[in-house]
Structure formats: structure tokens, C-alpha cells
């Protein structure tokens, strides 16, 4: 009778993570008597996967009844495959012996490759908010995929971005891989409702890429524009001055009125109105008793937005004996160049 050969018919097997791998092995003879063992890897550091004779291998099942003498099918199934199971598996026939069984013949090996899906991409933006016209960086990370080939794209509101850098690690062979990408995005005043999307395509996803998103509302800060306006007189000795705070984001805003540099009132934006672009408008008013003032009054609307240094707009009221008209201040920020006298 011809000497026993160990046949592993599959040079390679590709399995999706979580599924069961079948590793096929047959012997050409029932002689010699002795166990079959499966190993991952070769040489002295090889890892025992299954021993026909003894041991507990909860993830391994045999395809046929290996307890029987007439069995020549030594195929095994390994359940719940993970990327860590990737490697070359050898079916090895031993000859019965003492004190140990003697290795008799090995199969040629079957390379198990594991297809593992990438994790859902996680997109993270800068730690601090930035204002329009600034460039900010977003990172996208996805882990645990195999094989290494992967495609990553960035989008802003559906428009593909081109300014990004991507790395897949490790560079060499590994059971699974990670991808890390950094994209640069220029902010505009209209970006409150914008989204940045990281899209990952991989062979395991069957053409249905994974997406991670970041809302620019978490990143952008749109500073307000201020306008101080003098309203018609409510009573003979009272002037109503309004401060229009426009196009700001986020909502966190505190406004302080100063009369000749002295704090008159401080309030926090509450009942704001929202613009279509996601920014907010708010208006505060101050009733000034002109008769209480002998000299001209400098009114300042000072706004602290989202913890940033305060910006302000001033309006000068000229106090006179016979007030007859009123106007509006359209002066530039932090100045009171356009004066309106009250007669």
C-alpha cells in the first residue's frame, strides 16, 4: 500500500468575520494508526488548533466522526471567525507512539483570510470653535477591517472634498487594519447647517459604504453684527434705544448696556429668532430718561458672544432743552460718530 499522504485541497479560504471557516483535510490511507492535529503556522512556535486525541476546543467541530478507525476525512470547522484567526493552517498526521506521538506527515497548508468589516467611521472636529474664513481640521477613524484595501472620501454638504490626508495602519501584514484621515475645511458664515461626511468603502460592505458625520454647528462660531438705533420718543423725557444683534451662532450671548461707561443693565439672550441659515437674531432695548441727564449721554451696547472678548457699538444722545427730532445711529462698531441731538 502507498504511503499515507495528507491532502489539503484548498490553498486558501476566505471567510467573513463572525462566520464559520471550513478547513478541508483528507488522508489517502488509514495507516499508520495515530491522531490528526491541526496547527496554525509552522515550526516550533505553531499554535495547536485541534487535537483529535485530547483537549477541549470549543470553537472547533469535525466534519466527520473522527472517533472511527475507518475515517479519512479530518476536515474541521472553526466557528465565529475573527481577524485574529487569519493565518496558514496545517493538517498534520501523527503516528501512535510513546512517550509522545510522532509527527508523520503534514498537509501543504490552507491560508485562512478573514474579511472583516470596518467599524462605523467616527468623525471628530476641532476642540475649539472657529469663525468663518478659518480652516479647520476634521479627523475620521475606522478600525478592524480586513483585507487592507479601503477607500475613504470626504464630503461637505454632498460636495466631495479634496484637501485631506489618509493613512492605513499598519503598513505591513496584519490580522486587521485601521484607517485615519484628516480633512481641512474652510468655514463660511452659512455653515451652521452644514455637515462634513466621511465615507468608507470596503469589499465587505457590498457597495454600501459606511458614513460618519460631523455637524459644523459643533465647530463654527459666527460672531454677531451690532446695530444701535434710536427709536421714537415714548414720552417727552424718554428715549428708546435698541441694540440689534444679528447673525450670530451659537446662541450663548450676554448683552450689557452702559450709560457713559457705567453698567445700566445686563441680560442673556433668550427669546431669539432663528434665521434660515441657522444663525440667530436678537434685539435689546433701553429706555433712557433724558431729563435725568444734564450732559450728553453715551450709550454702549456691549455683547459677549460664546465666551469671546466683548464687542460693542455706541450711540450718543445730546441732551437739550427742546427735543424735536430723533434719528438712528449707523456708526461703525465701537464708535459713536453719528450723533443725534434732541431739542
Amino acid at each position: 500500500e502507498e504511503e499515507l499522504q495528507v491532502i489539503q485541497p484548498d490553498k486558501s479560504v476566505l471567510v467573513a468575520a463572525g462566520e464559520t471557516a471550513t478547513l478541508r483535510c483528507t488522508a489517502t490511507s488509514l495507516i499508520p494508526v495515530g491522531p490528526i492535529q491541526w496547527f496554525r503556522g509552522a515550526g516550533p512556535g505553531r499554535e495547536l488548533i485541534y487535537n483529535q486525541k485530547e483537549g477541549h476546543f470549543p470553537r472547533v467541530t469535525t466534519v466527520s466522526d473522527l472517533t472511527k478507525r475507518n475515517n479519512m476525512d479530518f476536515s474541521i470547522r472553526i466557528g465565529n471567525i475573527t481577524p485574529a484567526d487569519a493565518g496558514t493552517y496545517y493538517c498534520v498526521k501523527f503516528r501512535k507512539g510513546s512517550p509522545d506521538d510522532v509527527e508523520f506527515k503534514s498537509g501543504a497548508g490552507t491560508e485562512l483570510s478573514v474579511r472583516a468589516k470596518p467599524s462605523a467611521p467616527v468623525v471628530s472636529g476641532p476642540a475649539a470653535r472657529a469663525t468663518p474664513q478659518h480652516t479647520v481640521s476634521f479627523t475620521c477613524e475606522s478600525h478592524g477591517f480586513s483585507p487592507r484595501d479601503i477607500t475613504l472620501k470626504w464630503f461637505k454638504n454632498g460636495n466631495e472634498l479634496s484637501d485631506f490626508q489618509t493613512n492605513v495602519d499598519p503598513v505591513g501584514e496584519s490580522v486587521s487594519y485601521s484607517i485615519h484621515s484628516t480633512a481641512k475645511v474652510v468655514l463660511t458664515r452659512e455653515d451652521v447647517h452644514s455637515q462634513v461626511i466621511c465615507e468608507v468603502a470596503h469589499v465587505t460592505l457590498q457597495g454600501d459604504p459606511l458614513r460618519g458625520t460631523a455637524n459644523l454647528s459643533e465647530t463654527i462660531r459666527v460672531p454677531p453684527t451690532l446695530e444701535v438705533t434710536q427709536q421714537p420718543v415714548r414720552a417727552e423725557n424718554q428715549v428708546n434705544v435698541t441694540c440689534q444683534v444679528r447673525k450670530f451662532y451659537p446662541q450663548r450671548l450676554q448683552l450689557t448696556w452702559l450709560e457713559n461707561g457705567n453698567v445700566s443693565r445686563t441680560e442673556t439672550a433668550s427669546t431669539v429668532t432663528e434665521n434660515k441659515d441657522g444663525t440667530y437674531n436678537w434685539m435689546s432695548w433701553l429706555l433712557v430718561n433724558v431729563s435725568a441727564h444734564r450732559d450728553d449721554v453715551k450709550l454702549t451696547c456691549q455683547v459677549e458672544h460664546d465666551g469671546q472678548p466683548a464687542v460693542s457699538k455706541s450711540h450718543d444722545l445730546k441732551v437739550s432743552a427742546h427735543p424735536k427730532e430723533q434719528g438712528s445711529n449707523t456708526a461703525a462698531e465701537n464708535t459713536g460718530s453719528n450723533e443725534r441731538n434732541i431739542y
Partner: antibody, heavy 118, light 107 residues
């Protein structure tokens, strides 16, 4: 059902010969090593011989040169040719299948009695 | 040849008892050891092979352990049908050899 049935036992004079047979059924006979084991009355078990799948044979020193094991795979039968019999060969002879992967004996026949006496 | 020595040669026990029979080989036999049960006038019945593997159909009250040269057969809770003679056998190399047997009797 897996079954082994021995036959051919009986009374024989010292120096005489006897041929035992074992009929196998319920399994692929050619794929198993087959053994003979004997047991003298009131004594323990003694392994007598084996024939492997490929026809290779082994015997203990006590029967070597006198006993010959053979198999007819086409007829699913095992034989033990016993020559130069001695009184010490008196025993119940069992055929057994090396049915486990490691050739452990898993199935035994009911036995046939061989008596060597003048 | 490899000698197999069983102890004790005989053992008295009661129904429900847990009993252990030992078997010692004269040299290392790896774990190629089998246990058989034999009742008077009957053929031996295989219980355990490769030291601890239960033969198909054998109840789990029978268990085997050991390696190298020292082996044990344990019956966890004796029942009336378990009173019989038990043999160990090495089958690592020819000639296969048996222990002399342990007769388990009712106390």
C-alpha cells in the same frame, strides 16, 4: 447493527490444529484492524494477534510461529489458524474490532471455546 | 513487552459508592489506555479508550484519567449492574497487553 460472530472452536489434542473464523457484519470490514483475544477459564484477558488494514500482522511471543491470522475482505471474515496447540492454549477466543481511530478495541464477539486436551 | 498492573485485584463496595481502580504501566504508554468491563460468561465490553474518551453508549458515571504510566477508572455511583470484573489494556505498541483484572463485588 455491528456484529462479530466467532466459530470453529472445539476440542483438539495437543499438537493438533484448529481454524477459527469470525464473521463481521454491519460495518466496512476492510477499513478496520481486526484482533484476536483469548481468556482461559477464570483467568484474565490475553491479546493473541492483529491483522491490519493492509494485511500486516503481529503476535505475542506465546503464539508466534504457531498461530496465523488472516482476513478475507470480500467475505467480511477473519481467521485464526492455530497449529501445534498446547494445553495452555485452552481458552475462549474472542475476535474484536480495532474500531476507534487509535485502534482501541470497541466491538467484541461472543467468543468461541477452544479446548486442547488429550 | 509492557506489563500492566491493576490494583486492587478485588474490591467490595456498596450500591451508591464511588470507586476507583488504578492501572500502572511498566513504561510510558502516552495515553493509549483502554478500560473494559466483563461480566461472568460474557464478552468484554469497551468502556473507555485513549485514557478518558467514553465509548459510544457508555454512561457518564464512568470516567478515566491519567497519563504516562499511571491511570485510573472511576465509577461515580455504583449500581447493581456495575458489579463485574474490570480490565485495563495498553495499545500503544504490540503486543497489546492487559492488566490482570479487578473484581468488583457487592459488599
Amino acid at each position: 447493527e455491528v456484529q462479530l460472530v466467532e466459530s470453529g472452536g472445539g476440542l483438539v489434542q495437543p499438537g493438533g490444529s484448529l481454524r477459527l473464523s469470525c464473521a463481521a457484519s454491519g460495518f466496512t470490514f476492510s477499513s478496520y484492524d481486526m484482533h484476536w483475544v483469548r481468556q482461559a477459564t477464570g483467568k484474565g484477558l490475553e491479546w493473541v494477534s492483529v491483522i491490519g488494514i493492509s494485511g500486516d500482522t503481529y503476535y505475542p511471543g506465546s503464539v508466534k510461529g504457531r498461530f496465523t491470522i488472516s482476513r478475507e475482505n470480500a467475505k467480511n471474515s477473519l481467521h485464526l489458524q492455530m497449529n501445534s496447540l498446547r494445553a495452555g492454549d485452552t481458552a475462549v477466543y474472542y475476535c474484536a474490532r480495532g474500531g476507534n481511530w487509535d485502534d482501541a478495541l470497541d466491538i467484541w464477539g461472543q467468543g468461541t471455546m477452544v479446548t486442547v486436551s488429550s | 513487552d509492557i506489563q500492566m498492573t491493576q490494583s486492587p485485584s478485588s474490591l467490595s463496595a456498596s450500591v451508591g459508592d464511588r470507586v476507583t481502580i488504578t492501572c500502572r504501566a511498566s513504561q510510558d504508554i502516552n495515553n493509549y489506555l483502554a478500560w473494559f468491563q466483563q461480566k461472568p460468561g460474557k464478552a468484554p465490553k469497551s468502556l473507555i479508550y485513549t485514557t478518558s474518551s467514553l465509548q459510544s453508549g457508555v454512561p457518564s458515571k464512568f470516567s478515566g484519567s491519567g497519563s504516562g504510566t499511571d491511570f485510573t477508572l472511576t465509577i461515580s455511583s455504583l449500581q447493581p449492574e456495575d458489579f463485574a470484573t474490570y480490565y485495563c489494556q495498553q495499545y500503544v505498541s504490540y503486543p497489546y497487553t492487559f492488566g490482570q483484572g479487578t473484581k468488583l463485588e457487592i459488599k
